[in-house]
Structures are given as C-alpha cells and as structure tokens.
Interface confidence: low
C-alpha cells in the first residue's frame, strides 16, 4: 500500500510539476503535507531556473549534477541526495519526510555523524578508564602518563616516581617533598627557596610594595599599617588603605550667633574691655545652654585687678563669687540649669545688691556695701573674660573651681552695650561657633585624644590592680581606638577599639594587648541612633566583658601570657587615653585611628569628666554631643 502511494505521488509530481509548471499550492496537493512541500518547493524553483528554455546551456556548464529537468525534480524528494551525512562517520542514510536519518559508525555521533565520540569524556567510562591522560583520536582513543610517572602494563594506569628518595640532596637545606609526578623544595611561610644556593631566604615583602602606606617586614612575614590619625584604616585585603567612613552622620551645623565656651581646653574664649561713664554699673544678660555641671561662664574685674566678679556653674547651679575692697562673697542658688535647654541669665548690679535672674525670675540677691568696681578719673573700666579667667586669679578665688565649661551663650548684652563688636569677632572664627543642636554626652570628633592619670592599683585587692571600664558609646565611624593604656616605653599594654566588621553595617570590638588582639566581639550594630553599653573587667588573672548581647568571661590558651604582659606594664606607670592614641609607633596596636562619636567612660566606678583631663584636644566636647543627622527629603 505504501509503495502504491509513493507511485501515485510520483505520477502526480510528473504530471503537475514536470510536464507542466506548478505553484506552491499545486505542489502541496502532490505532497499533502507542509514539511515536504516547504522542503521541495525552493529546490524545485532552483531546478526551474537551471533548466528553463534559454538557460539550458548555462546550467550544463554549472555544477548541476542532473542532465534534465525531470531528473533534477525527481531527485528533490530524496533527502539523502546529495548525502547530508559525514562520510567518515556515517554507516547509512535513510530518507525521511523532508528530512533524513544518518546511522553512524561506532565512535561517531551527531545527526549527520559529524562528531567523533570523545571516549575520554564518556560519563559511563570516566577519562576512558585512563588513570591520567586520555588522548582522543577520530573514532578511538589511547592512555598516556604525565611527567614523573610511568605507564603500567595494563596500558591504562600510571605509577609515581619518588624523586626525593632517588636524589636525597636535591633540595639542599630545604625540605624535599615528593608530590605526585614531581617534587618540591619547601620553605616555611614568608621564606622563598633559592635555586642557586639551595636554601631558604626571607622574603622582604616590603620591598615588593605589598602595602599601600606603611609596611613592617620581619623574618617570615610582614604587616601593613595605615595612618589612622589621618583617617585611614586597613582594608579587608590587609594591604590597601581606605578612608574610615562615616556610619552615622551627625548634625554639625553651627551658628555664629551662638558663642562656644569650650573652644580652648585651657584659656579664655573671649576677652572684652569696657570704658564707660562712672555712673555705670556692672550688668550681663545672656541665654545659656549646657549639660556641663561646673565651669566659668564669665569673669569680670576692675582694671587694677582690685575687685572681681565670677559667674560660674557648680553642681549645675549658678554660683557667684565676688571680691572688692568692701566684701568677699560666694553664693550659689536657683534651679539646676545644666539641662541642655536655653536658659536666660541676667546678672545686674543694683545700688545695694547684685541681682541674679534666671528666666527673668530672681534666684539670688547678694548684698554689697558699695559699688562692685570703683570708678577712676570719671570712668568705670572693666575687663570681661568669657569661659575662663587669667591664670593668676586661680589662687585668689574664694572657692576653687574647674573653669572649663562646655556650653554656649547667645543674645548677650554686657554692660548694657548690646552685642556690638562681639558678633563681628566671632563671625570670622568657625571654632567659636556653637552647634545648633546638642545632646547629653561627650563627643570625640576623630581628630584628637584626652589624657587622664588614673591609679589602677588597688592595695586592698588580692589582684593588685584592676581595670573596670564601662563605656556608653554612639559611634559615628566604625573604626577607632576608644580607650588605651600607654606605657612609658611607648607600648600599648591594653586597648579597646572599634573596627568595621566584615559583615555589612556592623562593627567588631577588639580588646588588645600591645599589637595582639586578645578578644574580638563580632558583628554588633553599634552605628545606630541609640547608645550601646559595654563593660570590661580586667585584672592580672581574668578578663570579663559584657555587651548588649552577652556577658562572658574570656579564657583561651594565649590569654594568660597576654595578661602577664599587661600585669608587667600595670606594675609600672600607664597613662590613660580616650579617643585614640598618642604618638606611638603604627605597629603598637591593631588599630590606630581616632574614635569618632559620642562616648561616656566610667573607670573603676568613677565617671570620667573630660574637664578634669590632664590634656584634651580642643575639638573634643566634654559635655555635649551633636544630634544624629536626619536626611531631609523632597518628594
């Protein structure tokens, strides 16, 4: 039946497309399916172009294999003519509907048997069964061995040659290690094998510019350092340096109308001299804002220094000390005003008293027998000092006071002369401008340190010395030294530092003895708008710590050795630094960047007041911290 159908199709083809010309529709009626028609018709058109009248001669001269149109057209439906299969790889070709099937010889594959089967990559016979090298050849393959191996008799497996046993002195002073097919002359890490001398030599990694900034080479290794004091930290690759980036932006907006009283760690922030008619009396009005509890707001004195008036803060309340030829007085009163809010303060000399008002309410009235400052030659000459007093005054005070005051004043009016002249002085000097908004706390700007002298020796304790530290921190950068104990020989026997964690948006806390990290608290989210509370207790036997996430007593093999180093340093003298390190070598600690952010420190039960420091960088704010910057948005 099938052959009858083929014969019918052949007859139809003869009648429709050879004896007459057929279009594609008529050709489809012959084949009765699209695939064959689509295959046949373009080739039929080629036959027509070759054998139509007038083109016969040209066709015969071409590569056309058919003598006439009939044979050209009759050959079209045979998919195996011309042969589509690869001659090297095919066994047979079978014609199909508008297609063909090539049957391949062993070792070949592909629809046209065009691909040699790579026996070396046969998943059912891995590597062709060869133990080492499998070489594929057309239709076959064979095995071979790498250098340093010999082929076994099965022609598939290889055996290693042990060069170290064959030639024991092959590596000189280095260690010979036989490896499959070869040998290696091994050196310890940080050393390189020298082929000529057959020995191990130290690699000077620093000469190879391994580090971006500072490099320290030592036998068998090297360490890179970055200048933390210039705001750099070591990158994750432990070689390059990157800028210590801000993780919590702060609102550092200032206004020149606000006078910053803590511009200098030691010294007066502003000095004014008044020459007024003798009928003038002393008066000072200003708005005042601070979280500080003690310090000098202003000091006024006569030109000959015989009479003076001190307006200060003690225990958060206004204190007035005065001295002249008639009297010597000290008075404290009113509410606590170190609340971080603006308080209106006025001090006015009346005929028989000095009136002190806060928010226009009288809080103190100090009696005085005569004028505060005595006029001379028809003039009242007065000197006024803001946020301090001349050094010689210190010994004359009725009650000593720490003059340092972290606060701001605005809207001042001295001697009823308004603010004239003062604003102009302040406007030019950025560091005399006060922050617009502040919060309670101490602020380290990442550019300096504060030094304290603290005696850690506890005579009554069996441990001899102990360091109990409580830190309340709100960092603005993720890297910096928060606290360091520094020995006289410029080593750092103990430091607490912050470093950006490898995990995104978190920080690690490092406890270090000299340049060794003895403990790392990993992945804390410290760069947030809330404070984090950390506690450390260290003595010669123990190290305990408490973080928001855990309380832990640390013990590891190396700890006792490190605590012994610390113990030795603590028995000598150590200086305590907050916010960074003094001039010690880069390699003295794992971190050397300044701390940037807010931090309050309690050591051995004493809250450290930065006003009491031996020295402090001017930019560190003892009792105020900038607010977190909130992004402003536009739709």
């Amino acid at each position: 039946a099938n052959s009858l159908l083929e014969e019918t199709k052949q007859g139809n083809l003869e009648r429709e497309c050879i004896e007459e010309l057929c279009n594609k529709e008529e050709a489809r009626e012959v084949f009765e399916n699209d695939p064959e028609t689509d295959y046949f018709y373009p080739k039929y058109l080629v036959c027509l172009r070759s054998f139509q009248t007038g083109l016969f001669t040209a066709a015969r001269q071409s590569t056309n294999a058919y003598p006439d149109l009939r044979s050209c057209v009759n050959a079209i439906p045979d998919q195996c003519s011309p042969l589509p299969c690869n001659e090297d790889g095919y066994m047979s070709c079978k014609d199909g509907k508008a297609s063909f099937t090539c049957t391949c010889k062993p070792g070949w594959q592909g629809e046209k048997c065009e691909f040699d089967i790579n026996e070396c990559k046969d998943p059912s016979n891995i590597n062709g069964g060869c133990s080492q090298i499998c070489d594929n050849t057309p239709g076959s393959y064979h095995c071979s061995c790498k250098n340093g191996f010999v082929m076994l008799s099965n022609k598939k497996d290889c055996k290693d040659v042990d060069e170290c046993s064959l030639k024991p002195s092959i590596c000189g002073t280095a260690v010979c290690k036989n490896i499959p097919g070869d040998f290696e002359c091994e050196c310890p890490e940080g050393y390189r094998y020298n082929l000529k001398s057959k020995s191990c030599e130290d690699i000077d990694e620093c000469s190879e510019n391994m580090c971006a900034q500072l490099c320290v080479n030592y036998p068998g290794g090297y360490t890179c350092y970055c200048d933390g004091k210039k705001g750099f930290k070591l990158a994750q690759d432990q070689k390059s340096c990157e800028v210590v980036s801000v993780c919590l932006p702060l609102n550092l907006d200032t206004k020149y109308e606000l006078l910053y009283l803590a511009e200098q760690f030691a010294g007066v922030v502003l000095y004014l001299k008044f020459r007024l008619p003798e009928i003038s009396r002393f008066s000072a009005e200003f708005d005042f804002r601070t979280y500080d509890s003690e310090g000098v707001i202003l000091y006024a004195e006569s030109i000959d220094h015989s009479a003076w008036l001190l307006i200060a803060l003690r225990g958060g309340k206004i204190e007035v000390q005065l001295k002249n030829e008639h009297t010597s007085k000290i008075t404290t009163g009113g509410d606590v005003i170190n609340n971080g809010l603006w308080n209106m303060v006025s001090v006015e000399e009346l005929e028989h008293s000095i009136s002190i008002k806060i928010a226009k309410e009288a809080v103190m009235d100090i009696n005085k027998p005569g004028p505060l400052f005595k006029p001379e030659n028809g003039l009242l000459e007065t000197k006024v000092y803001f946020a301090g007093f001349p050094r010689k005054v210190e010994s004359e005070l009725i009650k000593p006071i720490n003059p340092r005051l972290d606060g701001c004043i605005r809207s001042w009016n001295l001697m009823k002369q308004g603010a004239s002249g003062i604003k102009e002085i302040i406007q030019e000097k950025q560091n005399k401008h006060c922050l617009v908004t502040v919060e309670k706390g101490s602020y380290y700007p990442g550019s300096g340190i504060a030094q304290f002298h603290i005696d850690y020796n506890n005579v009554s304790s069996a441990e001899g010395w102990h360091v109990n530290v409580t830190l309340n921190i709100r960092p603005s950068t993720g890297t910096g030294v928060m606290l360091a104990l520094v020995s006289g020989n410029n080593t750092v026997p103990f430091a607490v530092s912050l470093v950006d964690s490898t995990s995104e948006k978190s920080q690690d806390i490092l406890l270090s003895v000299e340049n060794t990290v003895i403990y790392r608290i990993q992945a804390l989210s410290l760069c947030s708008d809330q404070q984090s509370h950390l506690e450390f207790r260290v003595n010669r036997n123990n190290l305990e710590l408490s973080t928001p996430l855990k309380i832990e007593t640390i013990s590891h093999e190396d700890l006792q050795r490190q605590l012994a180093v610390l113990d030795k340093a603590m028995k000598a003298k150590v200086a305590t630094y907050l916010g960074g390190l003094p001039d010690v070598p880069f390699s003295a600690t794992p971190v050397n960047a300044f701390y940037n952010g807010c931090m309050e420190v309690n050591i051995n039960g004493v809250q450290l007041d930065l006003d009491e420091a031996i020295s402090k960088h001017n930019d560190i704010r003892a009792h105020s911290c900038p607010s977190v910057w909130k992004k402003t948005k536009n739709s």
Epitope: E439, K440, Q530, S627, V628, K630, K633, N634, S635
Partner: antibody, heavy 119, light 106 residues
C-alpha cells in the same frame, strides 16, 4: 489639611493575614515617616514599626519581626501594614501616625482600623 | 528596650485643680513625648521634646524633666482634660509608651 485615612474594619481567622492601608493627603508623603501603633481593647499603645516613604527604609519592633511587613506606594501616597499568622492576641485597633524624625511627636494619626481575630 | 513607668495609674481630681503626671524611664532618654487619648479616639500629641507644646494645645499644659524622670503638668484642669495620658520615648528602637495615666473627675 493633613489627613491620614485608614481602611475599614477587618475580621480574620487565626493563621490568616491582614493588610491595612493608610492614605496620606495634605502634605508631601515622602517627607515624613509613617509609624504603626496598635492598641488592644482596654490596653495601652504598642509600637509596631515605621517606614520612610522616601526610600522604604523600615524598622520593626522585635516582637513583630518576621510577621509584620511595612510597604508604601508613592504614586498613591499610601502606606500599608501587613500582619501575618494572626492570633487572637492581635485583636486591636491599628493606627498609622505621621512622624517627622528626632525631636518630633507623632503629630497626625489615622482614625484607626479595628482588626478582630476570631475562629 | 526602654521601659516607661507612669504614675499614678489613676488620678482623681476636680476641675480647676492642678494635675501632675509622672513618667519614669528605665534608662536615660533624650526627650519625652506626651499624648492625650479620649475613648474611641486616636491619641493626640500634647508635648514634644519634653517641654514644647504641640500645635493647638493650651498653655495650661506643660512638660519638664530630664534623664529618667519626666513630668506632665496641667495647671488648672478643664472638663475636656479628663482623659488617658501616655508618655513615649524615641531614644531607642523600639520606641515605647508608658502604661498610661487616667485623669478622672473626682
């Protein structure tokens, strides 16, 4: 004038989810955080989380972490709060409230959406 | 999280009297915020940043305090002031509210 208009009351079965909407008008939607606060019957106020419509930054109370999702649609000035795996203790009035950042109170509140969880 | 404890839980006073509401934080906060809530209504802000009056709030309301202790004072109670008052802090995540003080007519 500033208005926060919340979607209507919902009754849900335990284990289901609820999605409450809060449509803002009368101000620039992207300039203020939207907070979500709930109040169980006869109880006090409980903060759930907040979203900054400007960049979809979100913070959640630990208690609701994993169960609450805050989203927003800038084009319609609408904030959404979806609470999943509901239980009977989630029966409460849910409020959205506008907040301008540190130093500000939640100055405008939605009228509240009552969500009842009952089998 | 920071716990805010309000006292007293209930305050029974007559119109014209002075009301003093206390809010104590388990650790120091930067500022305190106060809200008034009447039955069936959403809370309404009274005081922001410890001592600033919210828009449209009469001057008889005042706030004070610092650190952990804060106070809301109503100098002379008006009939419309009888309600529940909540303190709230933003100083840590999560922000928290006090349990509330109910001011009722004596």
């Amino acid at each position: 004038q500033v208005q926060l208009v919340q979607s209507g009351a919902e009754v849900k079965k335990p284990g289901a989810s609820v999605k409450v909407s809060c449509k803002a008008s009368g101000y620039t939607f992207t300039s203020y955080w939207i907070n979500w606060v709930r109040q169980a019957p006869g109880q006090g106020l409980e903060w759930m989380g907040r979203i900054d419509p400007y960049d979809s930054e979100t913070h959640y109370a630990q208690k609701f972490q994993g169960r609450v999702t805050l989203t927003r649609d800038k084009s319609t000035s609408t904030a959404y709060m979806e609470l999943s795996s509901l239980r009977s203790e989630d029966t409460a009035v849910y409020y959205c409230a506008r907040w301008g950042g540190s130093g500000y109170a939640m100055d405008y509140w939605g009228q509240g959406t009552t969500v009842t969880v009952s089998s | 999280e920071i716990v805010l404890t309000q006292s007293p839980a209930t305050l029974s006073l007559s119109p014209g009297e002075r009301a003093t509401l206390s809010c104590r934080a388990s650790s120091s906060v930067s500022y305190m915020y106060w809200y008034q809530q009447k039955p069936g209504q959403a809370p309404r802000p009274l005081i922001y940043a410890t001592s600033n009056l919210a828009s449209g709030i009469p001057a008889r309301f005042s706030g004070s305090g610092s650190g952990t202790d804060f106070t809301l004072t109503i100098s002379s109670l008006e009939p419309e002031d009888f309600a529940v008052y909540y303190c709230q802090q933003w100083s840590s995540i999560p922000p928290t509210f006090g349990g509330g003080t109910k001011v009722e007519i004596k």
